[in-house]
Interface confidence: low
């Protein structure tokens, strides 16, 4: 296991006294109920805590809630329930916090049965003051802020009306009826689906997709026979019912729905689903469910147009529509994703890609770990990561994998070491190089969080017993110190730190229970005195990301460029600070054939990097050929991988072919063969 508090670990001096002076307890005079916590703004120190308690009476349930506010990262809280007139707040809508640092907050209140509409409380000063507003409708969903303008809100009503406010919820206008789903796009555009006949459920597959670019003054129908739609990066996706049967296909638009292209993906039947796993402005990862109740499907990665897809990973675990998948974007290193596959023997195995889905491999076995009972060969096995699926299966996994963009290379996750995921109690593993190598960090399940951009990692053991000890590491999980933060153990419910991992404060939430009472309590610990000084130049070292072969001058080239980072030395105990910016130096690589994907109608034979023309088009390739737009059917066989920045090197220039000539089928009439999807 990873070294603990032993000789080789340089202990932080006098840390008990330093932490004791910076540990702040707050007892909430609430019966237990439930608690929800939201950060308002970035680096503001403002936290809102909503406690709710349901008292079951004979006829109905009486709800009571309290609102607390902190402006010092949770060290002190003030009861501000009177600012919302002691109203009961509906927790299913949560606290709707405005984008960026707008300081806006919307709370949705519970109102009595016969009222004309709902009620909200609005704040635009980081919850210092609230304004009560009665709504002309009963909200079905949480208020949604426009990403571009936090004064613009939209909501769906229980009557399926689409309501918009242009003045941060002061006045509301119903802009459309019979709406199933609505989403903000870019430039304050709203996309929504409507039904014509009975209801959203009854009309599924016969919905219309509408767009308004002026908050409801004018509308354009941009799609018909719609099953559902989604937004990802600069792509707008719609699943559209086929003419002849109950199957549906994905169509893609990159111009807000003005024009559509059929995606070269398999069609799916009634019981199947599509899911956008991840998307950015360059490309999308799309999961396509297998027929039947298999619990798996295939991951496809798109080209830069979202039209041509390459098969990325087979047997990808994804249980049911809206079910569980372990797909995780490792945000601490570009191009890295982790997920699970369901193998032929029904065991679950973890796979990782370092090149945005181009190639998947097993995770390397941690050096300091033995292979468990799932391993056939005790010397050869892999690390398998527990994520959403394990949590849903009630395995002893308190947290999903964790990574932060500003804690470069660090990934923390529960896992087991063997041939597949084990149901045994997992341990916690850490990678400091974005998933290439792993080390056992902590024995047994823990809650964990990253502070000060990776300068501190904090963990608490997952236990059914009350706890009073927190562990922390200043060297990326190699060595750990323990600190007793209270004499009286608490039933632990969660760790909270400000999103973005820049803070040095951690809040430990839990409750105390005695014979008659139960109370919420939080302990906020500030680590600023542990990291006594600001980091200097000498505290950082140069690290080449994706380095696997230092002798190779193309070492680190991923998606056409390599990046060198300045990273904090493990031995340095200092503050990165709230203003820390990741320092990276990119350099362009020469192009190889691996920087190109095969365009429509081409494929890569095994162990070859050249794209070869498909001898005949079958299945969904043929459908794409028949219905795809003509300009997408002329190609030289290669297309640069989305986001790939390589220059020079190989430029796979070859004759441009018109694949329309290959589009033939006995099942479709000639006039259909020239039709463009529109």
């Amino acid at each position: 296991s990873a070294p603990g508090e032993d000789e080789e670990c340089g202990r932080v001096r006098d840390f008990v006294a330093k932490l004791a002076n910076n540990t702040h307890q707050h007892v909430f005079d609430d019966a237990r109920g439930s608690v929800s916590l939201s950060w308002v703004g970035d680096s503001t120190g403002v936290i809102l805590v909503l406690t709710t308690f349901h008292v079951p009476l004979v006829i109905m349930t009486f709800g009571q809630s309290k609102l607390y506010r902190s402006e010092d990262y949770g060290k002190n809280f003030k009861d501000i329930t009177d600012l919302i007139n002691n109203t009961f707040i509906r927790t299913e809508f949560g606290m709707a916090i405005g984008p960026e640092n707008s300081g806006k907050v919307v709370l949705t209140a519970e109102v009595s049965g016969g009222s004309r509409g709902g009620r909200i409380f609005r704040s635009s000063d980081f919850a210092k003051n609230f304004v009560q507003t009665d709504l002309p409708f009963h909200p079905l969903t949480q208020m949604m802020y426009s990403p571009q303008n936090s004064d613009y809100l939209l909501a769906l009503s229980t009557e399926n009306g689409l309501w918009v406010s242009k003045n941060f919820g002061g006045k509301w206008e119903e802009i459309h009826k019979a709406v199933c789903l609505a989403k903000w796009g870019s430039d304050n555009t709203i996309f929504f689906t409507t039904y014509a006949n009975g209801s959203c459920k009854a009309d599924l597959g016969a919905l219309e997709l509408w767009r308004t670019s002026d908050l409801g003054k004018s509308f354009k129908t941009i799609g018909v026979k719609i099953y559902s739609f989604g937004l990802g990066g600069r792509f707008l996706f719609a699943s559209v019912m086929a003419d002849k049967d109950t199957t549906r296909r994905i169509h893609v638009s990159t111009d807000q729905g003005d024009t559509w292209s059929m995606a070269q993906l398999p069609s799916v039947g009634q019981e199947q689903f599509y899911s956008i796993l991840a998307a950015n402005d360059d490309m999308v990862f799309m999961h396509v469910d297998e027929p039947g109740d298999t619990g798996f499907g295939t991951i496809f990665t798109s080209d830069d147009r979202g039209i041509v897809y390459s098969k990325s990973l087979d047997r990808h675990l994804y249980t049911t529509t809206g079910g569980e998948t372990d797909f995780t974007n490792v945000t601490s290193l570009r191009g890295v994703y982790i997920t699970s596959v369901l193998s032929e023997d029904n065991s679950i195995q973890t796979m990782i890609t370092f090149d945005q889905g181009g190639r998947w491999t097993h995770l390397r076995k941690p050096e300091n770990s033995e292979c468990d009972a799932t391993a056939k060969n005790k010397n050869e096995c892999s690390l398998h990561i527990h994520a959403s699926y394990s949590i849903s299966q009630k395995l002893n996994v308190p947290m999903a994998p964790l990574s932060e963009p500003n804690a470069v290379g660090i990934v923390i996750a529960h896992g087991s070491v063997g041939d597949a995921i084990s149901v045994m109690v997992p341990d916690v593993y850490i990678s400091d190089d974005g998933g290439y190598s792993w080390t056992k960090m902590l024995e047994g399940p823990h809650y964990y969080t990253i502070l000060d951009s990776g300068g501190i990692i904090v963990a608490i053991e997952h236990s059914s017993r009350p706890i009073n000890v927190i562990k922390f590491s200043t060297d990326e999980g190699q060595c750990w110190q323990t600190y007793t933060f209270t004499r009286d153990p608490i039933y632990f419910t969660g760790l909270a730190s400000e999103p973005g991992a820049r803070s040095m404060n951690i809040s430990i939430w839990g409750f105390t229970e005695s014979f008659l009472t139960s109370q919420w309590v939080s302990y906020t610990i500030d680590f600023k005195d542990i990291l006594e000084r600001n980091c200097e130049e000498k505290d950082y070292t140069i690290w080449l990301a994706h380095s696997t072969d230092p002798e190779d001058y193309e070492d680190g080239c991923i998606l056409g460029y390599k990046e060198q980072f300045l990273r904090l030395r493990k031995s340095s105990v200092c503050q990165n600070g709230r203003d820390y910016v990741v320092t990276k130096q990119p350099s362009i690589c020469l192009c190889s054939l691996e920087d190109f994907l095969c365009d429509f109608g081409y494929y890569r034979p095994e162990n070859d990097s050249k794209c070869v023309e498909q001898p005949e088009l079958k299945g969904h390739d043929l459908e794409f050929c028949l219905y795809g737009r003509e300009e997408h059917l002329t190609t030289n066989g290669y297309r640069k991988i989305p986001g790939d920045k390589c220059q020079g090197g190989v430029n796979p220039v070859r004759e441009v072919k018109d694949l329309k000539k290959k589009c033939t089928s006995n099942f479709l009439s000639p006039e259909k063969q020239n039709s463009k999807s529109n």
Epitope: D549, E551, D552, Y553, L590, S592, E594, D608, G648
Partner: antibody, heavy 129, light 107 residues
């Protein structure tokens, strides 16, 4: 046609520096790395280092680290190799060679090496007091 | 660094005969190996790349084989213009390294 033309012969005193140029023509200059190889009289070939014309990044053999500097000028499609602190054992013919290293792949896991396919005519550097 | 060892140092062969040259790497270089021919007063010329692929314009009598650590260059029927020094070179790990060379001379 593709060719590499090197600068003329040089005679230098010990401790001095020499800068050899290599002008590329007949292909896109930024599409290939350039290696430098030297050959002492009656000896074998010795690789000195490589430069990526796109960004100018370099990789030098340990033996020459600190003494050799490779640069490029994309506007003239020319690479340069400068060797400092010359000693008599640096007397050799210095070649530039187009090196497509690693620019194509032979399948999932391995790079494919295309070899140094075009060589300059060589520049003789004599170090003598 | 990877050490490349060529044998024999000198090979005496009659015109029309077959010549077999060996090259051994101190560790695996996969198939990242090239063969060059050099005649007196000339720059080296690429013969074989990727351990076994003939470069453009190279006659079919030259062939390369092997992978990992053991490689062979075969000249099936020596012509008068083939008498020269032959070098192998690895490009698996930096620094690129050459073998010491095999001189093919007329017997």
């Amino acid at each position: 046609q593709v060719q590499l033309v090197q600068s003329g012969a040089e005679v230098k005193k010990p401790g001095a520096s020499v800068k050899v140029s290599c002008k590329a023509s007949g292909y896109t200059f930024t599409s290939r790395y350039m290696s430098w190889v030297r050959q002492a009289p009656g000896q074998g070939l010795e690789w000195m280092g490589i430069i990526n014309p796109v960004g100018g990044s370099t990789s030098y053999a340990q033996k020459f680290q600190g003494r050799v500097t490779m640069t490029r000028d994309t506007s003239t499609s020319t690479v340069y190799m400068e060797l400092s602190s010359l000693r008599s054992e640096d007397t050799a013919v210095y070649y530039c060679a187009r090196d497509p290293s690693g620019i194509a792949a032979a399948g999932p896991a391995s790079r494919y090496y295309y070899g140094m396919d075009v060589w300059g005519q060589g520049t003789t550097v004599t170090v003598s007091s | 660094e990877i050490v490349m060892t060529q044998s024999p140092a000198t090979l005496s062969v009659s015109p029309g005969e077959r010549a077999t040259l060996s090259c051994r790497a101190s560790q695996s270089v996969s198939s990242n190996l090239a063969w060059y021919q050099q005649k007196p007063g000339q720059a080296p010329r690429l013969l074989i790349y990727g351990a076994s692929t003939r470069a453009t314009g190279i006659p079919a009598r030259f062939s390369g084989s092997g992978s990992g650590t053991e490689f062979t260059l075969t000249i099936s029927s020596l012509q008068s213009e083939d008498f020269a020094v032959y070098y192998c070179q690895q490009a698996r790990l930096g620094p690129w390294t050459f073998g010491g060379g095999t001189k093919v001379e007329i017997k």
